[in-house]
Interface confidence: low
């Protein structure tokens, strides 16, 4: 069971300092941006991280949403990352959900975060280069210290 607590506005970056944004096709991508670019591209660069109380504490349970014309929430259905047009629900009556991730700091690096899927244990949000795009994907943790699954989260409130 997950019960919604508070939400905060955040900018999410990979460890190459590329900014996560949602493009016109609703795809989550990373791109080099100055602070000015990041502001100019809002709200596509501003993510609503909603925190949830977890009946089985396993880390900070969160959803990641973005509000452009409508609110879309990040999902990892079938281990595929996509934004689905939906509000983060107030309650989720299950021990896992495609939209719930466990946000945890990287041991020894309090400012670096990992997001593990609640549906797919051992799978984390990651940045992966595909041709000329840097995409947000779900991947299994292959090795300790894998930088692709580490992010910084900067609160904008």
């Amino acid at each position: 069971y997950f019960g919604k607590l508070e939400s905060k506005l955040s900018v999410i970056r990979n460890l190459n300092d590329q900014v996560l944004f949602i493009d016109q096709g609703n795809r989550p991508l990373f791109e080099d941006m100055t602070d000015s670019d990041c502001r100019d591209n809002a709200p596509r660069t501003i993510f609503i991280i909603s925190m949830y109380k977890d009946s089985q504490p396993r880390g900070m349970a969160v959803t990641i949403s973005v509000k452009c014309e409508k609110i879309s929430t990040l999902s990892c259905e079938n281990k595929i990352i996509s934004f689905k047009e939906m509000n983060p629900p107030d309650n989720i009556k299950d021990t896992k959900s495609d939209i719930i991730f466990f946000q945890r700091s990287v041991p020894g690096h309090d400012n670096k975060m990992q997001f593990e899927s609640s549906s797919y244990e051992g799978y984390f949000l990651a940045c992966e280069k595909e041709r000329d795009l840097f995409k947000l994907i779900l991947k299994k943790e292959d090795e300790l210290g894998d930088r692709s699954i580490m992010f910084t989260v900067q609160n904008e409130d």
């Epitope: 259905e77 079938n78 281990k79 244990e121 994907i137 299994k140 943790e141």
Partner: antibody
Framework: EVQLQESGPGLVTPSQTLSLTCTVS??????????WTWIRQHPGKGLEWIGY???????YYNPSLKSRLTISVDTSKNQFSLKLSSVAAADTAVYYC?????????????WGQGTLVTVSS | EIVLTQSPGTLSLSPGERATLSCRGS???????LAWYQQKPGQAPRLLIY???IRATGIPDRFSGSGSGTDFTLTISRLEPEDFAVYYC?????????FGGGTKVEIK
């Protein structure tokens, strides 16, 4: 190379519970990253995904079977199991266990040879 | 649920000919999350293609996949005797995971 082998009774009485076990060899079920899957094929028909499980016990079920379905895992025996309750003739099928390839998406690179389960009185 | 429709149901061809198999989704399989399998009588399916066009390990290059959105194609450039089998497409974009009904490639 990973190998999967299904085992269990080939004949089940209507309204009873169908129970199958898949034994994995050539690799550890707890190595992580892979979801262990059950798929069935009705005689002369196409394939139907039943559900899958992670080594930790986390499961994902086909909604059409969810109310009757339990998939479990025993890492000490390197096995995972399927239980389908209240079976009917429509559950007669070849049941396959399989391993998903890992990474993004759910598709299967290793399969058992399949076992035919007939539901009949 | 995404329903996959395969056509034709049966394809009668001779060895050496080109086979073109179609798989159509009831809605878009976005980002191309589609796989193809080959199944021979009495055997389990064998993964051929995933990600629309990526050949699985050990699959010969006469097998190729293409398509996007709702329309996907598996092409066998020159049929070998061992290629006569049933072929299934499978989507892993939406839940539940679903398969097409299959296309049988038989010897003419």
């Amino acid at each position: 190379e990973v190998q999967l082998q299904e085992s269990g009774p080939g004949l089940v009485t209507p309204s009873q519970t169908l129970s199958l076990t898949c034994t994995v060899s050539g690799g550890s079920i707890s190595s992580g990253g892979h979801y262990w899957t059950w798929i069935r094929q009705h005689p002369g028909k196409g394939l139907e995904w039943i559900g899958y499980i992670y080594y930790s016990g986390s499961t994902y079920y086909n909604p059409s079977l969810k109310s009757r379905l339990t998939i479990s895992v025993d890492t000490s025996k390197n096995q995972f199991s399927l239980k389908l309750s209240s079976v009917a003739a429509a559950d007669t099928a070849v049941y396959y266990c399989a391993r998903d390839r890992g990474g993004s998406g759910s598709y299967w690179d290793y399969w058992g040879q399949g076992t035919l389960v007939t539901v009949s009185s | 649920e995404i329903v996959l429709t395969q056509s034709p149901g049966t394809l009668s061809l001779s060895p050496g000919e080109r086979a073109t198999l179609s798989c159509r989704g009831s809605r878009s399989v976005s980002s191309g999350y589609l796989a193809w399998y080959q199944q021979k009588p009495g055997q389990a399916p064998r993964l051929l293609i995933y990600g629309v066009s990526i050949r699985a390990t050990g699959i010969p290059d006469r097998f190729s996949g293409s398509g996007s959105g709702t329309d996907f194609t598996l092409t066998i450039s020159r049929l070998e005797p061992e290629d006569f089998a049933v072929y299934y497409c499978q989507q892993y974009h939406g839940s539940p995971l679903t398969f097409g009904g299959g296309t049988k490639v038989e010897i003419k």
